[in-house]
């Protein structure tokens, strides 16, 4: 019987900004029942507080509602596991909630074939940002990326958008039914999972691009 | 106790390329964005470009674009610097640093001296 | 780029003495979500540099108090209360609002 190992805070998620939820991953259990608390202050503060909510982000987390989260603070955590023998912590770690931003996937995914007489066919793709993430404030900028493949192929083709929300892609196989996916980074943060898919059928007179 | 443990001095011939790495060890490498920075003799820091290991993602400064690529191995946890067409200019020591959840630079490698000489 | 011009360039100062670092930016480092990222480093002789203030004002983990930082938009100062002999190298200030990052010239602090 020991005391517990050292525990690593090793994940912090928000979606949007306004809260987040750090995990850490516990060390060794020493071979007794072991209790975890994490205990954290705010830049300029010398006052400890406790995790708020230990129950919304799951086993081994702590997760900050809306009036514990404050963009404009960088939070210094730390994780202490206790059992009957003693007590070990974690390394305190740095949280500035702008960089552990990962957005929702996007939203609205449609997909078009278009065929203008005068130029090569494309195809064209088009989506909106996620809901919950506010673009006006102007300090978050996402960046997109789109994956597409013939239903039945086993690799994905992957373009980067961007900032921008559509995108034309021209070298595609006619006659094949396509799946398109979408998903969204904010540029020092996270990307977000992919899209649900969206299925296009490509046309048997569909040009290949030279 | 975080560590991050660089490749050794190199030598090299303009027009070149090297490759310096950084290993990570004392915490979940995918966990943090790593930088890399560089000072060339009696100078000031510039900074290179930075990786996320969780998924190879990368930012470079525009003056290196081109030359260098940053890239990672998560089965080593180790970061790597390429940089090419070598120039007198670039010869530098140049380090690997790790943020935590943020954008600023915690914890540095010991550094790796690259000369550029013909 | 962001450019970060440190003054003096050098500074001898006697053991128990303060000392006062400045450094300007060439734009306003106060980033869009309201936080300014300008932070001060201390490379100690034949070390790799060490993280002091973050933030313009917030000590790192571990590092006496008398070192504090100061200012806002493109003005900013690094302050040692009472300088010791271990404090001796080269201070440089860096911004992480605008990428690229960029770094001051840095200051060489020596013990008279």
């Known amino acids: 019987q020991l005391p517990p190992g050292k525990p690593e805070i090793f994940k912090c998620r928000s979606p949007n900004k306004e809260t987040f939820t750090c995990w850490w991953r516990p060390g060794t259990d020493g071979g007794l029942p072991t209790n975890y608390s994490l205990t954290y202050h705010r830049e300029g503060e010398t006052l400890m507080h406790e995790c708020p909510d230990y129950i919304t982000g799951g086993p081994n987390s702590c997760h900050f509602g809306k009036q514990y989260t404050s963009m404009w603070r960088t939070y210094i955590m730390m994780v202490n596991a206790t059992n009957q023998m003693g007590s070990s912590f974690s390394d305190e770690l740095y949280v500035d909630v702008t960089y552990i931003v990962q957005p929702d996937p996007p939203l609205e995914l449609a997909v078009e074939v278009k065929q203008p007489e005068d130029r090569k066919p494309y195809l064209w793709i088009k989506w909106s940002p996620p809901t919950l993430i506010d673009l006006k404030t102007g300090w978050f900028t996402l960046l997109y990326e789109i994956r597409l493949k013939p239903e039945k192929a086993a690799e994905w083709e992957i373009h980067f958008a961007g900032q921008q929300t559509e995108f034309k892609i021209l070298s595609l196989h006619p006659g094949q039914k396509y799946l398109v996916q979408v998903r969204c980074k904010p540029d020092h943060g996270y990307w977000s999972a992919w899209s649900p898919a969206t299925f296009i059928q490509i046309p048997s007179d569909f040009t290949m691009n030279d | 106790e975080v560590q991050l443990v660089q490749s050794g001095a190199e030598v090299k011939k303009p027009g070149s390329s090297v490759k310096v790495s950084c290993k990570a060890s004392?915490?979940?490498?995918?966990?943090?964005?790593i930088h890399w920075v560089r000072q060339a003799p009696g100078q000031g820091l510039e900074w290179i470009g930075e990786i996320d290991p969780s998924d190879s993602y990368t930012n470079y400064n525009q003056k290196f674009k081109g030359r260098v690529t940053i890239t990672v191995d998560k089965s080593t946890s180790t970061a790597y610097m390429e940089l090419s067409s070598l120039r007198s200019e670039d010869t530098a020591v140049y380090y690997c640093a790790r943020s935590f959840f943020t954008n600023w630079f915690a914890y540095w490698g010991q550094g790796t001296l690259v000369t550029v000489s013909s | 780029d962001v450019v970060m011009t440190q003054t003096p360039l050098s500074l001898s100062v006697t053991p128990g003495q303060p000392a006062s670092i400045s450094c300007r930016s060439s734009?306003?480092?106060?980033?869009?979500?309201?936080?300014?990222?300008l932070h001060w480093y201390l490379q100690k002789p034949g070390q790799s540099p060490q993280l002091l203030i973050y933030k313009v004002s917030n000590r790192f983990s571990g590092v006496p108090d008398r070192f504090s930082g100061s200012g806002s938009g493109t003005d900013f100062t690094l302050k040692i209360s009472r300088v010791e002999a271990e404090d001796v190298g080269v201070y440089f200030c860096s911004q992480s609002t605008h990428v690229p990052f960029t770094f001051g010239g840095g200051t060489k602090v020596e013990i008279k």
């Open positions: 734009q306003s480092l106060v980033h869009s979500n309201g936080n300014t990222y």
């Open positions: 004392g915490y979940t490498f995918t966990s943090y964005w």
